[in-house]
Interface confidence: medium
């Protein structure tokens, strides 16, 4: 299937990286810089040549809460996350590439700066390929490292 996503036409001011309000972190890492929208995240990923990490979650979901706790408290994850464009969402986007096997939460997906969804970077659960549990921090770290190895794209 085609896993290349199309960014919106939204423009962004170049080289402006103000510290965003902590509310955008929603508790996933207050010291990290989080983007506000999917379109903005795609734009930043493409222009900065950094992969995008998208976390879909819900505040009322206990699994989301549990994963958020270990994500925010794990120093390695927080450090590695600095190398990503970051987005956490409590709603679904219209991009079906971000829910290839369902709109469950929490799920974590990666998008290459070439705007290709990294469908190959999966968790360990067959029912929910992009789900992670609190015990999966080592796997998530490995997957983040995989995502940092950017896809080679032909010019």
């Amino acid at each position: 299937r085609d896993t290349t996503v199309k960014p919106g036409a939204k423009k962004d001011t170049k080289d402006s990286r103000p510290k965003l309000p902590q509310t955008l972190s929603r508790g996933w890492g207050d010291q990290l810089i989080w983007t506000q929208t999917y379109e903005e995240a795609l734009y930043k990923s493409k222009t900065s040549n950094k992969p995008l990490m998208i976390i879909h979650h819900l505040d009322e979901c206990p699994h989301s809460q549990a994963l958020k706790k270990v994500f925010a408290e794990n120093k390695e994850i927080q450090k590695l996350a600095e190398q990503f464009v970051l987005l956490n969402l409590v709603y679904e986007t219209t991009d079906k590439h971000l829910s290839p096997d369902g709109q469950y939460v929490p799920r974590i997906m990666f998008v290459d700066p070439s705007l290709t969804v990294r469908a190959d970077i999966t968790g360990r659960y067959s029912n929910r390929l992009y789900a992670y549990e609190p015990a999966d921090t080592a796997l998530l770290l490995d997957n983040m490292k995989k995502a940092l190895k950017l896809l080679k794209t032909e010019l």
Epitope: D120, G123, Y125, N127, L129
Partner: antibody
Framework: QIQLVQSGPELKKPGETVKISCKAS????????MNWVKQAPGKGLKWMGW????????TYTEEFKGRFAFSLATSASTAYLQINNLRNEDTATYFC??????????WGQGTSVTVSS | DVVMTQTPLSLPVSLGDQASISCRSS???????????LHWFLQKPGQSPKLLIY???NRFSGVPDRFSGSGSGTDFTLKISRVEAEDLGVYFC?????????FGAGTKLELK
């Protein structure tokens, strides 16, 4: 630790029904699908299909459509295989196996089903 | 269905020998997501199969490093660097790239 414990051996007559259980422990049951695999005496392994333990949706291979049914008791972290209208050729050991995104990592010990008149 | 052909069907060895088992698939096992879902299992008499190697070359937890897997596309190999008594049994390759999941017929590793 992760375990899949299956019910004991069964001796049945042709035409009868058997229901095998597979109780999971040591992990979140609804995060992993469950495979069912048949191994006839002296034969290889044959995948029968799987059940999505999250949605309860079963998927059967062509050979195992009709008389075979996968089901769940999610609250008891248990998967079931039921075989209706048993035939002699159903004599085999049946295994359940946990499905991960990568492979089938943990298997039950197997349940021997003997069909004989 | 994808046919998995294992060779040899029987492999007599002495303890300490290196053993090599081949598995060939009737079509490529490269998934559309780029992964290759080719796995190796060991089944000892009266027991259930145990996962040794998943996705061609990844050792499952607790599997000794004398076991290694390699291959690509349609040709895959399981190697045991120094056979120990506990390694005897039937080895199955399996693919889960395509539905239905299929297994090889098995290779019996036995003492000479």
């Amino acid at each position: 630790q992760i375990q899949l414990v299956q019910s004991g051996p069964e001796l049945k007559k042709p035409g009868e029904t058997v229901k095998i259980s597979c109780k999971a422990s040591g992990y979140t049951f609804t995060n992993y699908g469950m495979n069912w695999v048949k191994q006839a005496p002296g034969k290889g392994l044959k995948w029968m299909g799987w059940i999505n333990t999250d949605t309860g949706k079963p998927t059967y291979t062509e050979e195992f459509k009709g008389r075979f049914a996968f089901s769940l008791a999610t609250s008891a972290s248990t998967a079931y295989l039921q075989i209706n209208n048993l035939r002699n050729e159903d004599t085999a050991t049946y295994f359940c196996g946990r499905v991960t995104a990568d492979s089938m990592d943990y298997w039950g010990q197997g349940t021997s089903v003997t069909v004989s008149s | 269905d994808v046919v998995m052909t294992q060779t040899p069907l029987s492999l007599p060895v002495s303890l300490g020998d290196q053993a090599s088992i081949s598995c060939r698939s009737s079509q490529s096992l490269v998934h559309s997501n780029g992964n290759i879902y080719l796995h190796w299992f060991l089944q000892k008499p009266g027991q259930s199969p145990k996962l040794l190697i998943y996705k061609v070359s990844n050792r499952f937890s607790g599997v000794p490093d004398r076991f290694s897997g390699s291959g690509s596309g349609t040709d895959f190999t399981l190697k045991i660097s120094r056979v120990e008594a506990e390694d005897l049994g039937v080895y199955f390759c399996s693919q889960s790239t395509h539905v239905p999941l299929t297994f090889g017929a098995g290779t019996k590793l036995e003492l000479k």
